[in-house]
Amino acid sequence: RKAVLDCEAMKTNEFPSPCLDSKTKVVMKGQNVSMFCSHKNKSLQITYSLFRRKTHLGTQDGKGEPAIFNLSITEAHESGPYKCKAQVTSCSKYSRDFSFTIVDPVTSPVLNIMVIQTETDRHITLHCLSVNGSLPINYTFFENHVAISPAISKYDREPAEFNLTKKNPGEEEEYRCEAKNRLPNYATYSHPVTMPSTGGDSCPFCLK
């Protein structure tokens, strides 16, 4: 009789579908992730099962707390889709599918500088390229650790370019660029390139 009651409850809002989620949706290969399967009903003893496509990954019992499944994303197929099943006695409901986005981290970008020197100004062109990493990549240029450009999005493997004009400065300036894609909290920086101060003939990046 209890199973019948539970199945009847499933047809109402007392036992809705479980929710499958992860704090991390964008991952890189080799990353460990936790998947949470939770249910609004906090009073029932629920058996949670996790599936990826058509393979069974594990089963946990829980009451009031979400089931936590820890996985390592090492292969492309492990992006998903995943689904979670909540079962009470002989009745069960499934979550919506959940998939991770696997992103290759960006490698340290290379910054190239080209300068056209006039009597009064320096016309500087900065090029920044990260040769590895999932697209799109956002590039930001820095001068003396201060951002001087907006994020420049590149959807192809071409360098980001930023132009600026400076009055001939009296002191050295350091430039670098940052490359970042959809991986959260994962940005890489180029080696700094120092522009020497004006004076004499020292302009190694200048076009003569």
Epitope: F51, K54, T55, H56, G58, H77
Partner: antibody, heavy 119, light 112 residues
Framework: EVQLVESGGGLVQPGGSLRLSCAAS????????ITWVRQAPGKGLEWIGT???????YYSTWAKGRFTISRDNSKNTVYLQMNSLRAEDTAVYYC?????????????WGQGTLVTVSS | DIQMTQSPSSLSASVGDRVTITCQSS????????LSWYQQKPGKAPKLLIY???RLASGVPSRFSGSGSGTDFTLTISSLQPEDFATYYC????????????FGQGTKVEIK
């Protein structure tokens, strides 16, 4: 070349034990599922059990307790340990590989090994 | 236990005939489509024909097709060829009482 090779079959007395091996080549058992299937002479296919890429094992109701599936990743080999064998366990035993993340879409099969339980 | 009932258990047909084999499960398969079909010839290992109930496995001729969902499935050979005389099995995957698989008892397709 992707292939599975079963070994370890033969004649065994009722009540005896036997361990079958399924050697995989051309792919890794840490990605694919291996399933054991048997076929008694003149009969149909029967699912015995499965070990998935995570090492989780699943068994048919009748096999639970008597049959155990394990694997050795370093040897890329899956084993079927069969205990308390009976005459009705006489069959050709196959191991088969599933698609990635699809345990029972069995697209690669071994040639089978014959187990005969008789006194 | 889950029962997979295949019908007919055997049939006689001629080259060029349209052949239909059905598989009925006592419970819904996982995802409503966790079902595959296999062909087996005497002394040989089975060969995967159809997966996901209706998707053709690699290298399988297009005269083979599958359909169905939940508990009722069909394998159709649109125009039987000499090499198609064999025994056919369905295999369902389930998660209702653990993670479980079950074969149908087989259908032998013979020459009329």
């Amino acid at each position: 070349e992707v292939q599975l090779v079963e070994s370890g079959g033969g004649l065994v007395q009722p009540g005896g034990s036997l361990r079958l091996s399924c050697a995989a080549s051309g792919f890794s058992l840490t990605i694919y599922t291996i399933t054991w299937v048997r076929q008694a002479p003149g009969k149909g296919l029967e699912w015995i059990g499965t070990i998935n890429s995570y090492g989780n094992t699943y068994y048919s109701t009748w096999a639970k307790g008597r049959f155990t599936i394990s694997r050795d990743n370093s040897k890329n080999t899956v084993y079927l340990q069969m205990n308390s064998l009976r005459a009705e366990d006489t069959a050709v035993y196959y191991c088969a590989r599933g698609y990635v993340d699809s345990d029972w879409y069995l697209n690669i099969w071994g040639q089978g090994t014959l187990v005969t339980v008789s006194s | 236990d889950i029962q997979m009932t295949q019908s007919p258990s055997s049939l006689s047909a001629s080259v060029g005939d349209r052949v239909t084999i059905t598989c009925q499960s006592s419970e819904s398969v996982y995802d409503n489509n966790y079902l595959s079909w296999y062909q087996q010839k005497p002394g040989k290992a089975p060969k995967l024909l159809i997966y996901d109930a209706s998707r053709l496995a690699s290298g399988v001729p297009s005269r083979f097709s599958g359909s169905g969902s939940g508990t009722d499935f069909t394998l159709t050979i649109s125009s039987l060829q000499p090499e198609d005389f064999a025994t056919y099995y369905c295999l369902g995957g389930y998660d209702s009482s653990g993670w479980y698989a079950a074969f149908g008892q087989g259908t032998k397709v013979e020459i009329k």
